[in-house]
């Protein structure tokens, strides 16, 4: 804001002069600028207890420029408005008010919510998530071998985070139990403890291909359990498929 304060040089008639400094078109000793040169805005500037006229190239915060033929001035925005385009269109509200369509409101209208960061009334945004990604491989303790039952996981992304009043996001992670075809761990696939452990020789009646039940890997000590015969294993496989459960974790 460029301010110009007038100083009288040539007496036109009582208290008015046209030989002013800066942006003043007419001025007086007592009042400063009375009117401004074209395109400048008249404003009152408080100096101590006194207000004097100044001419500005743009209006200060809380004011907007009004232009009439050959007479422009800075006009106050409404009481609840900090910056405005004109009397009826606010662009930033004072503290405690929310901006909506150029107006400052105590509360936002139905269907809108207050954004306390921008101090605006905004549309309520509901959560949006992507389609599920494919299920991960069936694993147990990070391994895909050496067990029969494990868990598999799938995830989806949050495309749109919800606003304060929006619907919460559904779970983005889903875990379920799974079964795998018996598969011996190749050399180097088993965990350190598994490699260090001296395996017992199979008892009579046990299948050499049989792998430990999932429970046998759940214990960190990996205590071997009794092996199942082939008939029992088939029976268990059917039961496991029926029992397959989905566990969700909310993010």
């Amino acid at each position: 804001q460029n301010a110009s304060r007038g100083r009288r040089q040539r007496r036109m008639h009582p208290n008015v002069s046209q030989g002013c400094q800066g942006g003043c078109a007419t001025c007086s000793d007592y009042n400063g600028c009375l009117s401004c040169k074209p395109r400048l805005f008249f404003a009152l500037e408080r100096i101590g207890m006194k207000q004097i006229g100044v001419c500005l190239s743009s209006c200060p915060s809380g004011y907007y420029g009004t232009r009439y033929p050959d007479i422009n001035k800075c006009t106050k925005c409404k009481a609840d408005c900090d910056t405005c385009f004109n009397k009826n269109f606010c662009t930033k509200c004072k503290s405690g008010f929310y901006l909506h369509l150029g107006k400052c409101l105590d509360n936002c209208p139905e269907g809108l919510e207050a954004n306390n960061h921008t101090m605006e009334c905004v549309s309520i945004v509901h959560c949006e998530v992507s389609e599920w990604n494919p299920w991960s491989p069936c694993t147990k303790k990070g391994k895909t071998c050496g067990f029969k039952r494990g868990t598999e996981t799938r995830v989806r992304e949050i495309i749109q985070h919800p606003s304060a009043k929006g619907n919460l996001c559904p779970p983005t992670n889903e875990t379920r139990k799974c079964t795998v075809q018996r598969k011996k761990c190749q050399k180097g696939e088993r965990g350190k403890k598994g490699r260090e452990r001296k395996r017992k020789k199979p008892n009579k009646g046990e299948s050499k291909e049989a792998i430990p039940d999932s429970k046998s890997l759940e214990s960190s000590k990996e205590i071997p359990e009794q092996r199942e015969n082939k008939q029992q294993q088939k029976k268990r496989k059917v039961q496991d498929k029926q029992k397959s459960v989905s566990v969700s974790t909310v993010h």
């Epitope: 036109m12 007086s28 033929p69």
Partner: antibody, heavy 119, light 107 residues
Amino acid sequence: EVQLVESGPGLVKPSETLSLTCTVSGDSITSGYWNWIRQPPGKGLEWIGYISYSGKTYQNPSLKSRVTISRDTSKNQFSLKLSSVTAADTAVYYCATYYGYGGPFFAYWGQGTLVTVSS
Amino acid sequence: DIQMTQSPSSLSASVGDRVTITCKASQDIDSYLSWFQQKPGKAPKTLIYLTNRLVDGVPSRFSGSGSGTDYTLTISSLQPEDFATYYCLHYDEFPLTFGQGTKVEIK
């Protein structure tokens, strides 16, 4: 001292055009803002419009379609024309001036002229 | 347009009385307010501008105050020559509008 004097017919017929002139002395109409104001008998004041130092005009929107303000700088005069008058336009018409927002608004007035609209 | 509501519309007072006239604007007029005195058959005379600035030659018993939407003209000690009609005028924006007037009569 700035002086303003209104002149024009005191009687105008309905539907005709009221024409008044304000002659200024003590200052040039090429500085300041030159206004017309009226006052119906026994009532309050109503601002009609102004002509600026450069000859630009602004009228009260309530009268705009009927008002024309013009000037003659060679005679240091400005004029008011109000068309399609009715009895409601009967009033004392004043010319007055101001020099900007920072000084007295309407520091100088003419003595006023009564215009009666009647057939 | 900004409306100016002046009160009272008339009042009766005696010489020496303190008289207060108020003007209420329909919106904040940011101190752009003048007061005029008008006597019968005469043109109005400007007393005060920018809310509280006295025009040269106007007696100091006249004073103005106010801000926002509410403004007051005070005559501290009414004199015989003060019996007249008083008008407020806002000039915060165009069109300019006057109050309806307050007639100060002798009691």
